[in-house]
């Protein structure tokens, strides 16, 4: 398939509430009308899909209702937010962008964003 450049930050630290946000930017070679954005997680040699959304240019991203991802789009930039992360979810999160319509089909894969998640320490019970 035709290749397309996708850029994303190298490292992101999740908040104490387990939320991580990063920007995925793609160099669109043409006038895409429908774009599919997928977040992949690479652990060891396994690559799995975390979430995916399709959007018409100029409209908002629509993730499934039960998705752990939300996002907004602006031109060739997608602002992605992943929620509900735990320390065990620390890993490389890859942004994949597919230009679905009009033809030809383009696919771009980012180098991945290493998301670090630290579980908050439980608050000690205090006796007053």
């Amino acid at each position: 398939c035709k290749a397309m450049h996708v850029a994303q930050p190298a490292v992101v630290l999740a908040s104490s509430r387990g939320i991580a946000s990063f920007v995925c930017e793609y160099a669109s070679p043409g006038k895409a009308t429908e774009v599919r954005v997928t977040v992949l997680r690479q652990a060891d040699s396994q690559v799995t899909e975390v979430c995916a959304a399709t959007y018409m240019m100029g409209n908002e991203l629509t993730f499934l209702d039960d998705s752990i991802c939300t996002g907004t789009s602006s031109g060739n930039q997608v602002n992605l937010t992943i929620q509900g992360l735990r320390a065990m979810d620390t890993g490389l999160y890859i942004c994949k962008v597919e230009l679905m319509y009009p033809p030809p089909y383009y696919l771009g894969i980012g180098n991945g964003t290493q998301i670090y998640v630290i579980d908050p320490e439980p608050c000690p019970d205090s006796d007053f």
Epitope: C1, A3, L40, V47, E49, T54, K96, P103, Y105
Partner: antibody
Framework: QVQLVESGGGVVQPGRSLRLSCAAS????????MHWVRQAPGKGLEWVAL????????YYADSVKGRFTISRDNSKNTLYLQMNSLRAEDTAVYYC????????????????WGQGTLVTVSS | EIVLTQSPATLSLSPGERATLSCRAS??????LAWYQQKPGQAPRLLIY???NRATGIPARFSGSGSGTDFTLTISSLEPEDFAVYYC??????????FGQGTKLEIK
């Protein structure tokens, strides 16, 4: 083992319609993009249409756009091709073919093929 | 659309000989090219994908090479069952997926 079995071919008059089916077994149908590829008598291969693994996207050759519709039912492991406004030049053996959707590189090549069903458009 | 041109149209060789089939693309397809074999009355079969990788169950006598616009399918020592029509196909710029017009490999 993998099996793709086409059905629904036959002789039809120009301007009429026909619906082809392709029953799949032996692989995870819902992980594969599915194609129709045709071959006119004594000629080479011509790609006709593609439907995404989950049915969300469809693509067509210019020669059939607006006349043919590809669809699938993943619960039945079946692929369809609705052919309307048929023309003499649509006469061919129609093959269904699977193409694995690779998560990193997109739709793959035609790895499994059916034996084909012959569609003859003639008055 | 990308046009694939195969040569020669017909290749006449004897069993045991080496066969070299060519496929040229009208623009670069990187390494996104496959080769298929089709015998009379049968469906095509995937032989080589991404220019040089043998598909499952394909004998080692089949090999592919090339990138960009020029590709080659080589059969190192022809067996009787290798006589068939061979097609190249690209998945670089689609739709449409395009095939070459085919090379018929016949017994001399």
């Amino acid at each position: 083992q993998v099996q793709l079995v086409e059905s629904g071919g036959g002789v039809v008059q120009p301007g009429r319609s026909l619906r082809l089916s392709c029953a799949a077994s032996g692989f995870t149908f819902s992980s594969y993009g599915m194609h129709w590829v045709r071959q006119a008598p004594g000629k080479g291969l011509e790609w006709v249409a593609l439907i995404w693994y989950d049915g969300s996207y469809t693509y067509y050759a210019d020669s059939v756009k607006g006349r043919f519709t590809i669809s699938r039912d993943n619960s039945k492991n079946t692929l369809y091709l609705q052919m309307n406004s048929l023309r003499a030049e649509d006469t061919a053996v129609y093959y269904c073919a699977s193409a694995y959707y690779d998560i990193l590189t997109g739709p793959y090549y035609f790895d499994y093929w059916g034996q084909g069903t012959l569609v003859t458009v003639s008055s | 659309e990308i046009v694939l041109t195969q040569s020669p149209a017909t290749l006449s060789l004897s069993p045991g000989e080496r066969a070299t089939l060519s496929c040229r693309a009208s623009q670069s397809v990187s390494s996104y090219l496959a080769w298929y074999q089709q015998k009379p009355g049968q469906a095509p079969r995937l032989l080589i994908y991404d220019a040089s990788n043998r598909a499952t169950g394909i004998p080692a006598r089949f090999s592919g090479s090339g990138s960009g616009t020029d590709f080659t399918l080589t059969i190192s020592s022809l067996e009787p069952e290798d006589f068939a029509v061979y097609y190249c196909q690209q998945r670089s710029n689609w739709p449409p997926y395009t095939f070459g017009q085919g090379t018929k490999l016949e017994i001399k």
